[in-house]
């Protein structure tokens, strides 16, 4: 069964910077990746980035840069411009559309006790689903 992993990490050098890392474990080719925050895509989440393996990548504030790290994993850098840190308690979800498997989504957040540079474990939360 395909699986999506999500890691959320605070940058050690800049406490206002976060990076979301997501990956797809499974056969098939990825046709699109969507990163949302505040909940899953289509279920209250707001899209922060859309990445297509060949057409390009797009991101919207507070996301700074979306990029492919490998053929099956992506990263999204976020810049927290506010005085408080809304990212700390936020859920980030990554949805991978792949052929022929369909869509798979998983969510993660920064662990409450995170030290800079530490990341959430790459374990999918129960929002893993196939469309």
């Amino acid at each position: 069964t395909p699986e999506v992993w999500v890691q959320v990490q605070m940058e050690a050098t800049e406490l206002s910077s976060f990076t979301v890392h997501c990956g797809f474990l499974g056969p098939g080719s990825i046709s699109l990746v969507t990163v949302s925050w505040g909940g899953p895509d289509g279920a209250g989440g707001t899209k922060l980035a859309v990445l297509h393996p060949e057409l390009g990548t797009r991101q919207w504030a507070p996301a700074r840069q979306a990029r492919w790290e490998t053929q099956s994993s992506i990263s999204l850098a976020l810049e927290d411009s506010g005085a408080s840190s809304p990212f700390a308690n936020t859920t980030f979800c990554c949805k991978f559309a792949s052929f022929p498997e369909g869509s798979w989504e998983s969510c993660g957040s920064l662990p409450p006790s995170s030290d800079p540079g530490l990341s959430a474990p790459p374990t999918p939360v129960p929002i893993l689903r196939a469309d």
């Epitope: 699109l32 969507t34 949302s36 895509d41 289509g42 989440g45 707001t46 899209k47 859309v50 297509h52 393996p53 060949e54 057409l55 390009g56 797009r58 919207w60 504030a61 990029r67 492919w68 790290e69 490998t70 053929q71």
Partner: antibody, heavy 114, light 113 residues
Framework: EVQLQQSGPEVVKPGASVKISCKAS????????INWVKQRHGKSLEWIGD????????NYNQKFKGKATLTVDKSSGTAFMGLRSLTSEDSAVYYC???????WGQGTTLTVSS | DIVMTQSPSSLNVSAGEKVTMSCKSS????????????LAWYQQKPGQPPKLLIY???TRESGVPDRFTGSGSGTDFTLTISSVQAEDLALYYC?????????FGGGTKLEIK
């Protein structure tokens, strides 16, 4: 497949503002992420910016900041582009296109003339 | 901004001929992570909006005839039409799909003798 239907031609006076629309129909999950592109007569294409329907987030080409304002009404699947302080340089065909430019509207011709 | 330079600016060929047009970018369009080039080609016929032909430098959009072939990597790209048809009369644009602003080339005008 996404279909994009743009509003009709506009003739406006210098200094005025205008708002053109782009209605999307079809149903894939990146339908309503919309780009706007300018094409002056006999010239190449210029990307103006894009808009995210989830939160109204925008990305602009620096060249068009202050000139164009991009908005979207997610409920109707309609994107809008406002253009202000119009001059003859703004006379062009304006296109909307889907997120990765794989579907385009038919274009809206804007003529700025006194 | 990434500058896209196309050549030649116009081509005048007979039906059945092979045509090659060039597009050069001022910065690499190769994504090192997935080894994909974010370069697209568009065809614009008179009075019509542009139509996506090729993306990822070499992948044909669905429904595009196989006489259209895209190639290249990094900063140098080519669009080839193996046997030009009368309906290929159009302007052809390349586009940087790598980074904002998503700049277009000046275009190559294809005319049929």
């Amino acid at each position: 497949e996404v279909q994009l239907q743009q509003s009709g031609p506009e003739v406006v006076k210098p200094g005025a503002s205008v708002k053109i629309s782009c209605k999307a129909s079809g149903n894939t999950f990146t339908d309503y992420f919309i780009n706007w592109v300018k094409q002056r007569h006999g010239k190449s294409l210029e990307w103006i910016g894009d808009v995210n329907p989830d939160n109204g987030g925008t990305n602009y080409n620096q060249k068009f900041k202050g000139k164009a304002t991009l908005t979207v009404d997610k409920s109707s699947g309609t994107a809008f582009m406002g253009l202000r302080s119009l001059t003859s340089e703004d006379s062009a065909v304006y296109y909307c296109a889907t997120l990765f430019f794989d579907s385009w509207g038919q274009g809206t011709t804007l003529t700025v003339s006194s | 901004d990434i500058v896209m330079t196309q050549s030649p600016s116009s081509l005048n060929v007979s039906a059945g001929e092979k045509v090659t047009m060039s597009c050069k970018s001022s910065q690499s369009l190769l994504n090192s992570g997935n080894q994909k080039n974010y370069l697209a080609w568009y065809q614009q016929k008179p009075g019509q909006p542009p139509k996506l032909l090729i993306y990822g430098a070499s992948t044909r959009e669905s429904g595009v005839p196989d006489r259209f072939t895209g190639s290249g990597s990094g900063t140098d790209f080519t669009l080839t039409i193996s046997s030009v048809q009368a309906e290929d009369l159009a302007l052809y644009y390349c586009q940087n799909a790598h980074s904002s602003p998503y700049t277009f080339g000046g275009g190559t005008k294809l005319e049929i003798k």
